[in-house]
Amino acid sequence: SWMWNQFFLLEEYTGSDYQYVGKLHSDQDRGDGSLKYILSGDGAGDLFIINENTGDIQATKRLDREEKPVYILRAQAINRRTGRPVEPESEFIIKIHDINDNEPIFTKEVYTATVPEMSDVGTFVVQVTATDADDPTYGNSAKVVYSILQGQPYFSVESETGIIKTALLNMDRENREQYQVVIQAKDMGGQMGGLSGTTTVNITLTDVNDNPPRFPQSTYQFKTPESSPPGTPIGRIKASDADVGENAEIEYSITDGEGLDMFDVITDQETQEGIITVKKLLDFEKKKVYTLKVEASNPYVEPRFLYLGPFKDSATVRIVVEDVDEPPVFSKLAYILQIREDAQINTTIGSVTAQDPDAARNPVKYSVDRHTDMDRIFNIDSGNGSIFTSKLLDRETLLWHNITVIATEINNPKQSSRVPLYIKVLDVNDNAPTGLSTGA
């Protein structure tokens, strides 16, 4: 019967001679050279050679366990004289023994990961994995330990799992957003002489709402003409927020001030500006200055950061109303006057009054629009607005006179207003009856 144990061969042999594997031996072999040993199977005759007389096997080449860990060969012992086998052909194994010739290799050369800023210490970031081609069942050649070469004190790595975690409190994206962490994987359980590999992990802190909006100035002033219709934008204010995305979104509101009902603020979603607009008609003569308190706030607030203070800021907005010269205003929309048809020339019929609505109360002068009184029947006192006749009237000719009176600001003739006057001529019995009458 055959006499051998399993053969073991150390990989990566560096000696100058062939590497000795072991000896095939049959108990039929009496040492007289009558037996011939034959080798067949994986690598026989090429990788593995056998001394046909002694049964000694040698490896002719350097072997790599990671390439092929086991070789299956067959052995024969043949009687040289008869050519017959003295043993049944038998299969045997040459097992390649591992040495630590492979460093750990990470599954990625570069990892990218994100973690929210201001995360608690120990927050999971990413797991890196390195594999070692050496034999994990024998020794520590494939026992990998992870350590951090670059990236402290911000991050740490779990030595056995490769899990990277945050290691520093209050890491602030607004202060620093990008970190490059270098992780080492070392075999031999991290001991001296172990082989190592590294990978780079690019970590980006993602934004959380940890910054409130802030107005760059405490006071703003805008001016607007009193004639601005509701909806008119009169100024823009902008609070800045160090956060990004929805965390930097700002809503503006008017929270206080005399102009609370006179002005609105709308948020321009594109520019994140607050646009102050006119809400109600303004009047310089009523109020010239409004002071508003405008607030900028984040609509999306993270409760855990409320301890940092309110996520809003306020500024004072002073709005100065500009005077717009307005034309005189008559006391009535139309005047109806009456006069007897027998009135003498220069008889006063009545009067009109108009006033400059501006605060300056510019004096007003009156005149008759002659296009409406071509015959110059009526006249007006330019100073006090008294209407009087300048010709005799006849009701039978014209019952109603429709004229227009103009009021003009003395200091600013461009500012004028018009009002209609309806003058009714009252009948006086000044005409004898006409036609024939017959008596009975």
Epitope: S218, E285, R318, E322
Partner: antibody
Framework: EVQLVQSGAEVKKPGASVKVSCKAS????????MHWVRQAPGQGLEWMGW????????EYAQKFQGRVTITADTSTSTAYMELSSLRSEDTAVYYC???????????????WGQGTLVTVSS | DIQMTQSPSSLSASVGDRVTITCKAS??????LAWYQQKPGKAPKLLIY???TLQTGVPSRFSGSGSGSDFTLTISSLQPEDFATYFC????????FGQGTKVEIK
């Protein structure tokens, strides 16, 4: 030419009131804002408030709110500034100054009165 | 409220000197700034408005510059009548004056 002529110096006791006048000429009194500014001895200038004589509207500095009253008499083109509850810190020269704009309450002061010294002393 | 800070608070100079006075606002006031000159016992006199516009009748040796929150008044060649106190004033929002700079004879 525009002129602002103020009333003469006053000596007042603490707790009393003082009323300083400022007569305007050379322009339409009702069309410009009239401001009051004071200057304590050896100190800087301090804005107190304004009036628009056209309709009597006023605005006062927060510091003087409740203690100062500014009025105007358009018939005499005169503005008045009354300061009540006087204390020694109110010792100052009080100036009236015309606001450059008639159209809105803003801008610099282009003409100043000669000043009125108010001394508050017990 | 907007605060105005003037510097220096005083300076000594000789006739013919170039003098520079600065004024700093606590926030952006754009160009809403005036400079006044005041002599002892007199009312302030307007020199410059809108930061750099010379008031009618003011000698051209006076000039103003700046915008935002930093402003300068320059007297290119000091004359005997220029020894006085100079004030800056913001009128962007309300009214506030600097504490003044006294220009004295060296």
């Amino acid at each position: 030419e525009v002129q602002l002529v103020q009333s003469g110096a006053e000596v007042k006791k603490p707790g009393a009131s003082v009323k300083v006048s400022c007569k305007a000429s050379g322009y339409t009194f009702t069309r410009n804002f009239m401001h009051w500014v004071r200057q304590a001895p050896g100190q800087g200038l301090e804005w107190m408030g304004w009036i628009y004589p056209g309709d009597g509207e006023t605005e006062y500095a927060q510091k003087f709110q409740g203690r100062v009253t500014i009025t105007a008499d358009t018939s005499t083109s005169t503005a008045y500034m009354e300061l009540s509850s006087l204390r020694s810190e109110d010792t100052a020269v009080y100036y009236c100054a015309r606001g450059v704009y008639g159209g809105f309450a803003g801008g610099y002061f282009d003409f100043w009165g000669q000043g009125t010294l108010v001394t508050v002393s017990s | 409220d907007i605060q105005m800070t003037q510097s220096p608070s005083s300076l000594s100079a000789s006739v013919g000197d170039r003098v520079t006075i600065t004024c700093k606002a606590s926030q952006n006031i754009y160009k809403n700034l005036a400079w006044y000159q005041q002599k002892p016992g007199k009312a302030p006199k307007l020199l410059i408005y809108d930061a750099n516009t010379l008031q009618t009748g003011v000698p051209s040796r006076f000039s103003g510059s700046g915008s935002g929150s930093d402003f300068t008044l320059t007297i290119s060649s000091l004359q005997p009548e220029d020894f006085a106190t100079y004030f800056c004033q913001q009128y962007y929002s309300g009214w506030a004056f600097g504490q003044g700079t006294k220009v004295e004879i060296k």
